[in-house]
């Protein structure tokens, strides 16, 4: 049972006023949070581009049982004095399981330090916990970043598990469907855990597939034939 009741869910609305939250940090002081550079969303290597360690755990209204994975937030702090007051963008990659406020970001050491004045990163981290302001923003990944579909380990012609990542705009995914080449019917994948979607089917899935993903704001995007014929498990495929 959370010590503090969560705030209302943060939805895909933008340009809103700043909201108050508490912030802490975990992991290595200049690291990306989890020891294994992962997190509850299922993303790996969050220390590397495009997340580049600007990552964090959100509590229930932010993580939303995995639905918040990939969403982006501007965060800033004004106190203590080491705070720059300038907003930085963080990506939700993990679940904050022990919230201390209705909205609580448990940030990577790197992201926490990024709110500091230049040279004061360690000073800010030594505060440990602080008040911050946040608002949902559209995700803008570095140019050349492609939406990536990771076919999870164990996937086979009767079972396909997909992790969708690096989605511009809303960032988070609320529905995933696939369509086999030459067929008209979309097959709906079911949400599993983290940001992984899956389908179990008695009919063999051979590929190539077009993947359609829907973000929280309702935008549907199709990645045509992104998963090729002869696709392999534990392999990532980039949209064209």
């Amino acid at each position: 049972i959370p010590k503090v009741p969560p705030g209302p869910n943060i939805t895909a609305t933008y340009g809103d006023k700043w909201l108050d939250a508490k912030s802490t940090w975990y992991g290595k002081p200049t690291g990306a949070g989890p020891k294994d550079n992962g997190g509850a969303c299922g993303y790996k290597d969050v220390d590397k581009p495009p997340f580049s360690g600007m990552t964090g755990c959100g509590n229930t209204p932010i993580f939303k049982s995995g639905r918040g994975c990939g969403s982006c937030f501007e965060i800033k702090c004004t106190k203590p004095e080491a705070c720059s007051g300038e907003p930085v963008v963080v990506h939700i990659t993990d679940d904050n399981e022990e919230p201390i406020a209705p909205y609580h970001f448990d940030l990577s050491g790197h992201a926490f330090g990024a709110m500091a004045k230049k040279g004061d990163e360690q000073k800010l981290r030594s505060a440990g916990e602080l008040e911050l302001q946040f608002r949902r923003v559209k995700c803008k990944y570095p140019e050349g970043t492609k939406v990536t579909f990771h076919v999870e380990k164990g996937s086979n012609p009767n079972y396909l598990a997909l992790l969708v990542k690096y989605v511009n705009g809303d960032g988070d995914v609320v529905a995933v469907d696939i369509k086999e080449k030459g067929k008209d019917k979309w097959i709906e994948l079911k949400e599993s855990w983290g940001a992984i979607w899956r389908i179990d089917t008695p009919d063999k899935l051979t590929g190539p597939f077009t993947v359609r993903y829907t973000t929280e704001g309702g935008t549907k995007t199709e990645a045509e034939d992104v998963i090729p014929e002869g696709w392999k498990a534990d392999t990532s495929y980039e949209s064209k």
Epitope: G38, K44, K153, E191, S192, W193, G194, I196, D200
Partner: antibody, heavy 116, light 107 residues
Framework: ESGGGWVQPGRSLRLSCSAS????????MHWVRQAPGKGLEWVSG????????AYADSVKGRFTISRDNGKNSLYLQMNSLRPEDTALYYC??????????????WGQGVLVTVSS | ELVMTQSPSSLSASEGDRVTITCRAS??????LNWYQQKPGRAPKLLIH???TLQDGVPSRFSGSGSGTEFTLTISGLQSEDFATYYC?????????FGGGTTVDVK
């Protein structure tokens, strides 16, 4: 499984589960508990590569699941233990690697008793 | 969280009887439903996964059916070794949840 025993409320325990006879990193793993005379309660699960970890609401923020594929081992770090955590704790192997599906192999269970 | 409701909670039967146990999900779980058998002092054993697929080595007198929210485990021709407690469990989403169990004992 190992690491069980009697502990006072508020204290910590770490459970371990060592697997043999299977390719450990091909499967998701779970902890399931059973209070004396009661039914089964899923506690936590972890995907093959630790990419996803999930918890029951009753243990969220207190328990941490982890695995070491090199040692074929699964762990459950239990902090801030409560009397209601008293149970037989089973480690269980999933049929799948990346998503939860069905638990086809179970350990013999390890007893955790929390009381003052 | 998804609530799994099992009925009955207990039943008495004789060898050779046909036994039916029902499991209801609070919302659709498609066919992500498993059945386990547990005997006193033993770990649970997987009988059926994906609502109707018999696990290797499980006798064919066990069968499962249903999809969506309503599921059934049937034992056709109860044997002495089948007196045990049976649990359903959904794996559609986390937290994974079990039904409360059905104990099958000797009439």
């Amino acid at each position: 499984e190992s690491g069980g025993g009697w502990v006072q409320p508020g204290r910590s325990l770490r459970l371990s589960c060592s697997a043999s006879g299977l390719t450990f990193d091909d499967y998701a793993m779970h902890w399931v508990r059973q209070a004396p005379g009661k039914g089964l309660e899923w506690v936590s699960g972890i995907s093959w590569n630790s990419g996803v970890r999930a918890y029951a609401d009753s243990v969220k923020g207190r328990f941490t699941i982890s695995r070491d594929n090199g040692k074929n081992s699964l762990y459950l770090q239990m902090n801030s233990l409560r009397p209601e955590d008293t149970a037989l704790y089973y480690c269980a192997k999933d049929i799948r690697a990346a998503t939860p599906y069905a638990l086809d192999h179970w350990g013999q269970g390890v007893l955790v008793t929390v009381s003052s | 969280e998804l609530v799994m409701t099992q009925s009955p909670s207990s039943l008495s039967a004789s060898e050779g009887d046909r036994v039916t146990i029902t499991c209801r999900a609070s919302r659709t779980i498609y066919n992500y439903l498993n059945w386990y058998q547990q005997k006193p002092g033993r770990a649970p054993k997987l009988l059926i996964h994906a609502a109707s697929t018999l696990q290797d080595g499980v006798p064919s007198r066990f069968s499962g059916s249903g999809s969506g929210t309503e599921f059934t485990l049937t034992i056709s021709g109860l044997q002495s070794e089948d007196f045990a407690t049976y649990y359903c469990q959904q794996s559609h989403g986390t937290p994974l949840t079990f039904g409360g169990g059905t104990t099958v004992d000797v009439k």
